[in-house]
Amino acid sequence: LKGQEFAPSHQQVYAPLRADGDKPRAHLTVVRQTPTQHFKNQFPALHWEHELGLAFTKNRMNYTNKFLLIPESGDYFIYSQVTFRGMTSECSEIRQAGRPNKPDSITVVITKVTDSYPEPTQLLMGTKSVCEVGSNWFQPIYLGAMFSLQEGDKLMVNVSDISLVDYTKEDKTFFGAFLL
Amino acid sequence: LKGQEFAPSHQQVYAPLRADGDKPRAHLTVVRQTPTQHFKNQFPALHWEHELGLAFTKNRMNYTNKFLLIPESGDYFIYSQVTFRGMTSECSEIRQAGRPNKPDSITVVITKVTDSYPEPTQLLMGTKSVCEVGSNWFQPIYLGAMFSLQEGDKLMVNVSDISLVDYTKEDKTFFGAFLL
Amino acid sequence: LKGQEFAPSHQQVYAPLRADGDKPRAHLTVVRQTPTQHFKNQFPALHWEHELGLAFTKNRMNYTNKFLLIPESGDYFIYSQVTFRGMTSECSEIRQAGRPNKPDSITVVITKVTDSYPEPTQLLMGTKSVCEVGSNWFQPIYLGAMFSLQEGDKLMVNVSDISLVDYTKEDKTFFGAFLL
């Protein structure tokens, strides 16, 4: 019995078949953040829950020290949502002074770190101006896309202000990746 | 011929190979909602189109009575977008009285129901304060992530207010899931 | 050796096994747009980077003239994010006149074109009213879902106003698809 009987005619002979349940996958959920040192011009990275509740890592996809570690090369779908929450009216100056100014913003970046490469690579960015009139505002930023990653690459989620991240529920703020 | 000739060296022997076209999948699209009873402190669930237009269910993934029924255990990517629309300025009090108040909000929750488990599990939540100045406002909330589900689990989409959901077009409000 | 030793009992015999690395995939990233002709009532289509930086096409998924070309029939996950940026206060009339009016809006549409079908099909739409108080505003719209596509189908991303698209970074505005 020849292998190609199972494979469409255009399959490359060197591409191995692969059980889907065996692929590296992770879904991480929010925890309360403890402020840590980060470089001056780099947004701080979030740390995550990786095994309790809805969170899991499997098939050699490991989480360590704010990073998801990519265990094998391939195309991955990577996603994250961060829910931000603010307690102040971000644009009170405008209303009081009657003139526009530069609004504050909230930003999420999914970043790839490759040890052999000096600079991190920003894979995905969601950024939004926040010019809220009400004093209690909240909103999510969602990101997701496919990237070609190499074994040993590390993924993290950076945010513009760690103190604005809503960590109250695991379904509001999360981070995941899976090999396609 | 040995199975491992088709599989990378780290494949678990018990993980069966599987044709991708055979996996449970569904993409559901919005229909006009008819209000039904729901528990006092639980958001109402949306019902959906499952076979007309862009909507489909396949490979034993069935839709019934607001629920997507999971036909086999595994890791699923689940997503939804709900477009909300409003016809009143939600923060007029603020502008008139010159003081902030708690703004209204819009929320989407993707919920898992497991018959053997008493409480539904909230898998994903997108929630946003609405403090719009203009009286005709509209905006989407998008959610998507991967979860380990069990055969027999049921998925639904709940919203904070069914009357604010835009049901005019199938591309604005939708719900889907597929086995990875 | 029988094929079913690798396949669960419910697999259709005609569904071929398939190496994942061989599937059509693309991730396109933003470039500066050059305004081109478009039909009066149709939003203009964005054009994309398909090979530099994070962008790629592989396994017969080709990009040409604003379109992603679908090389084989199947279920695809399709996604896009467009970050919009504006330099004017969109609702100044409201604040000046003290009365609500119809706000401006930003819209993203992922559209399918089938040569044998006269009208394009809108697969996904994200639309948001923009009634920003601050004069420098920016925000993303994200879309993603699964669709059954046919060989030869073409995908494009249309936006309500090409001049508001943020083309400064490849991680802010992007478009992708992959066969499941």
Epitope: - | R32, Q33, P35, R85, G86, M87, T88, S89, E90, S92, E93, D104, S135, N136, D161, I162, S163, L164, V165, D166, Y167, T168, K169 | N41, P100, K102
Partner: antibody, heavy 116, light 107 residues
Framework: QVQLQESGPGLVKPSETLSLTCTVS????????WSWIRQPPGKGLEWIGL???????NYNPSLKSRVTISVDTSKNQFSLKLSSVTAADTAVYYC??????????WGQGTLVTVSS | DIQMTQSPSSLSASVGDRVTITCRAS??????FNWYQQKAGEAPKLLIY???SLQSGVPSRFSGSGSGTDFTLTISSLQPEDFATYYC?????????FGQGTRLEIK
């Protein structure tokens, strides 16, 4: 099945304030938009305004200076006040439920005549 | 305000006839568009919503089409109970506006 019932005086004097109440039964008022529409005898429909259960409102600019719509969720009622009425305000007044696309449930209407 | 212009303003037809009423919006309103039927002494009744969807309980001889600015209501085979006044309405932006009505009479 949601039902709406208008109530209030059928006769109002010019320059006075027209006051109507709509009672909602068969469903909660704590969702949806609640609207007032009027129809002068032999004429077409004119939208007056609406209220969300939270209390936020939207009025027709042509009537805005004279209209107030309010809601009482505890009684499942909403109300219309139209001040400084003239003979031109004589109409059948309908209360109705709306979502963001349609006006799907209507009261049977009540005729209000403005006359001295 | 968005103006809704219906035509014709009145129409005479017989039982069994196919009837078409049109409505034009003064600006694009996507599919935020509805048709209502009103009989003498009664409140309007929703027939078609979102331009082309049939309201539950409404006979299938009624159909709607259109998007953007131009919309059509079609009654495929007039029945005696269909003689009434028909209104179009937009909810794309406020103020919500109605067409002036089309009175459908027995010929």
């Amino acid at each position: 099945q949601v039902q709406l019932q208008e109530s209030g005086p059928g006769l109002v004097k010019p320059s006075e304030t027209l006051s109507l109440t709509c009672t909602v039964s068969g469903g909660s008022i704590s969702s949806y938009y609640w609207s007032w529409i009027r129809q002068p005898p032999g004429k077409g429909l004119e939208w007056i305004g609406l209220i969300y259960y939270s209390g936020s409102t939207n009025y027709n600019p042509s009537l805005k200076s004279r209209v107030t719509i309010s809601v009482d969720t505890s009684k499942n009622q909403f109300s219309l006040k139209l001040s400084s009425v003239t003979a031109a305000d004589t109409a059948v007044y309908y209360c109705a439920r709306a979502d963001v696309v349609t006006i799907d449930y209507w009261g049977q209407g009540t005729l209000v005549t403005v006359s001295s | 305000d968005i103006q809704m212009t219906q035509s014709p303003s009145s129409l005479s037809a017989s039982v069994g006839d196919r009837v078409t009423i049109t409505c034009r919006a003064s600006q694009t309103i996507s599919s935020y568009f509805n048709w209502y039927q009103q009989k003498a002494g009664e409140a309007p009744k929703l027939l078609i919503y979102a331009a082309s969807s049939l309201q539950s309980g409404v006979p299938s001889r009624f159909s709607g089409s259109g998007s953007g600015t131009d919309f059509t209501l079609t009654i495929s085979s007039l029945q005696p109970e269909d003689f009434a006044t028909y209104y179009c309405q937009q909810s794309y932006s406020t103020p919500i506006t109605f067409g002036q009505g089309t009175r459908l009479e027995i010929k």
